[in-house]
Interface confidence: low
């Protein structure tokens, strides 16, 4: 329904607190380098303006679109040209081109300092002194570092962040109470950001149809008792929500997400038996809970798929009448029967089915042509099953750190042109699939592992898109969303790569490695491992293992030495010489 004033409509729907938080997130995601105080000032100005529109929807400028209002406000930033360079050119454009221009300049890897966690007492004092500013700062810092973070979900994180400080700053042992909660929020936040980034990439790079297919498969697995029409309605609404959030329309997105949660809870009897607890929670918790809800039980009496999709004489007629609806029904029926498959596998099966119908429905004997289509699915199903089995065995044998190292070597050999920090970050995340998924029973391993790998490989794709250095990465990232993982799995050693010249500086370490946390120390060692492979791509696993074992022993020895720095200098030279000899450099 049309509203005289869109800004007044959203302010009234969301309330002042959520309105201000969402505008802050939106601005921080667009202007990622702007100081906190500047953003707060802009948000306050927008909020004051919104209030005048609530009072009188006919007031001047209240009829303008949110993009126009927000874009005009962002373009008042005095330092736009010097801070953002060509992004300032966006301000010369009219809507909707101006907003598209801002979206194109979102930076997945902004040049921002690492967030350092202050002492617990310092944080608690800041929280008590000015709770509102403290929480706004959290929203701002997360939003600018994660420009595609799902805004309504970030409000949920902020609520938990506030709850953690409220509880723990009164506790006897503040640190013991607070630090594990903050670690959990950080890890969950990174995962949430990466999952949303894949949704936005899916919409922006592969279009609405690709996202809808993903949503049909996932919601059908989650709500197998729901009718196809019900799932279709949910998919349409969910697509609107994510399109809005990925497009920077955060007020509309949050409002529509709340409406969708309300609809699901009002109709839970026809959707899922697992929603009851979620629907008793307040709004932010409710939406989060629904998004994470476990799969409902499959109906007991589901007939064979073959009847409607292979044996029926009306297959081509039904397909021709409404291709996407028929394929959607196929995907729905297949997915609700297979919670044990990954979403990307289900989408590969649907694509194979579509390709077969396109070919066979034009053939002389269509039925004869597509009769064996389900046989084509077998190798597609077995490939991820075998891959997961092999990798879980390797993970159980090596443990997480050494499993990550195996992946580091594997991926550096596949795409050695990719920057070392990106290879380390992505391979470490790929390696976490072991701890995350291998503990599950067979029936849950594939959806856990392959859909998680899709999220991690998307991180590689968006980081690589910013500075493309490898045609192979570009190819795997752009050709097919659902075949990204098989594409990367199929890559062999890049024979065209010219090894880097050996540089002893790369393997020079200092005493400060001894004071690093275990995680940071691992990253240093893994950085050296990647650089080693870039120097000697044909090195065998055994050679690399020997060098890395020597390196670990060297770090351990020098960290125990009285004169650490001298030890690192002298033993380091010996290690480099021994490594060169071992690798034939």
């Amino acid at each position: 329904d049309a509203h005289k004033s869109e800004v007044a409509h959203r302010f009234k729907d969301l309330g002042e607190e959520n309105f201000k938080a969402l505008v802050l997130i939106a601005f921080a995601q667009y202007l990622q380098q702007c100081p906190f105080e500047d953003h707060v000032k802009l948000v306050n100005e927008v909020t004051e303006f919104a209030k005048t529109c609530v009072a009188d929807e006919s007031a001047e400028n209240c009829d303008k679109s949110l993009h126009t209002l927000f874009g005009d406000k962002l373009c008042t930033v005095a330092t736009l040209r010097e801070t953002y360079g060509e992004m300032a050119d966006c301000c010369a454009k009219q809507e909707p081109e101006r907003n598209e221009c801002f979206l194109q300049h979102k930076d997945d890897n902004p040049n921002l300092p690492r967030l350092v966690r202050p002492e617990v007492d310092v944080m608690c004092t800041a929280f008590h002194d000015n709770e509102e500013t403290f929480l706004k700062k959290y929203l701002y810092e997360i939003a600018r570092r994660h420009p595609y973070f799902y805004a309504p979900e970030l409000l949920f994180f902020a609520k938990r962040y506030k709850a953690a400080f409220t509880e723990c700053c009164q506790a006897a042992d503040k640190a013991a109470c607070l630090l594990p909660k903050l670690d959990e929020l950080r890890d969950e936040g990174k995962a949430s950001s990466a999952k949303q980034r894949l949704k936005c990439a899916s919409l922006q790079k592969f279009g609405e149809r690709a996202f809808k297919a993903w949503a049909v498969a996932r919601l059908s697995q989650r709500f197998p008792k729901a009718e196809f029409a019900e799932v279709s309605k949910l998919v349409t609404d969910l697509t609107k929500v994510h399109t809005e959030c990925c497009h920077g329309d955060l007020l509309e997105c949050a409002d529509d997400r709340a409406d969708l949660a309300k609809y699901i809870c009002e109709n839970q009897d026809s959707i899922s038996s697992k929603l009851k607890e979620c629907c008793e929670k307040p709004l932010l918790e409710k939406s989060h809970c629904i998004a994470e809800v476990e799969n409902d039980e499959m109906p007991a009496d589901l007939p064979s798929l073959a009847a409607d999709f292979v044996e029926s004489k009306d297959v081509c007629k039904n397909y021709a009448e409404a291709k996407d609806v028929f394929l959607g029904m196929f995907l729905y029926e297949y997915a609700r029967r297979h919670p044990d498959y990954s979403v990307v596998l289900l989408l590969r099966l649907a694509k194979t089915y579509e390709t077969t119908l396109e070919k066979c429905c034009a053939a002389a004997d269509p039925h004869e042509c597509y009769a064996k289509v389900f046989d084509e699915f077998k190798p597609l199903v077995e490939e991820p099953q075998n891959l997961i089995k092999q990798n879980c065995e390797l993970f159980e044998q090596l443990g997480e750190y050494k499993f990550q190292n195996a992946l580091l070597v594997r991926y550096t050999k596949k795409v050695p042109q990719v920057s070392t920090p990106t290879l380390v970050e992505v391979s470490r995340n790929l390696g976490k699939v072991g701890s995350k998924c291998c503990k599950h029973p067979e029936a849950k391993r594939m959806p856990c592992a392959e859909d998680y790998l899709s999220v991690v490989l998307n991180q590689l794709c968006v980081l690589h898109e910013k500075t493309p250095v490898s045609d192979r990465v570009t190819k795997c990232c752009t050709e097919s969303l659902v075949n990204r993982r098989p594409c990367f799995s199929a890559l062999e050693v890049d024979e065209t790569y010219v090894p880097k010249e050996f540089n002893a500086e790369t393997f020079t370490f200092h005493a400060d490695i001894c004071t690093l946390s275990e995680k940071e120390r691992q990253i240093k060692k893994q950085t050296a491992l990647v650089e080693l492979v870039k120097h000697k791509p044909k090195a065998t696993k055994e050679q690399l293992k020997a060098v890395m074992d020597d390196f670990a022993a060297f770090v351990e020895k020098c960290c125990k030495a009285d004169d650490k720095e001298t030890c690192f200098a002298e033993e380091g030279k010996k290690l480099v010489a021994a490594s060169q000899a071992a690798l034939g450099l």
Epitope: R114, S419, N503, T506
Partner: nanobody, 123 residues
Framework: EVQLLESGGGLVQPGGSLRLSCAAS????????IGWFRQAPGKEREGVSC????????NYADSVKGRFTISRDNSKNTVYLQMNSLKPEDTAVYYC????????????????WGQGTQVTVSS
């Protein structure tokens, strides 16, 4: 994740000197090679000098050899570019950039960049 801030630029007469600083915040310079680049109006960004993470290895563009000296002070998390005998053709915006452990041969090999500082050599 990384912030680099250049300072020390300004207007100087031909034959004069300037010392540029590149300060890092939010990370430790120890494990990064730092390169200095410059870009004159209408020209490509070009490498000027680079120092590897340990400070043991440095390199310079032919046009600045013998006039410019790069150094690092890891305790201050800062890299310096001492520029002597400046010429009008040294006029440009000077940028520092960081790459893991070693110097790179191409501009795109650097992972992190500063915002730049203007150096103008004119009488």
């Amino acid at each position: 994740e990384v912030q680099l801030l250049e300072s020390g630029g300004g207007l100087v007469q031909p034959g004069g000197s300037l010392r540029l600083s590149c300060a890092a915040s939010g990370f430790t310079l120890d494990y990064y090679a730092i390169g200095w680049f410059r870009q004159a109006p209408g020209k490509e960004r070009e490498g000027v000098s680079c120092i590897a993470s340990s400070g043991g290895s440095t390199n310079y563009a032919d046009s600045v050899k013998g006039r410019f000296t790069i150094s690092r002070d890891n305790s201050k998390n800062t890299v310096y570019l001492q520029m002597n005998s400046l010429k009008p053709e040294d006029t440009a915006v000077y940028y520092c950039a960081a790459a893991v452990l070693e110097c790179r041969t191409v501009v795109r090999g650097y992972d992190y960049w500063g915002q730049g500082t203007q150096v103008t050599v004119s009488s």
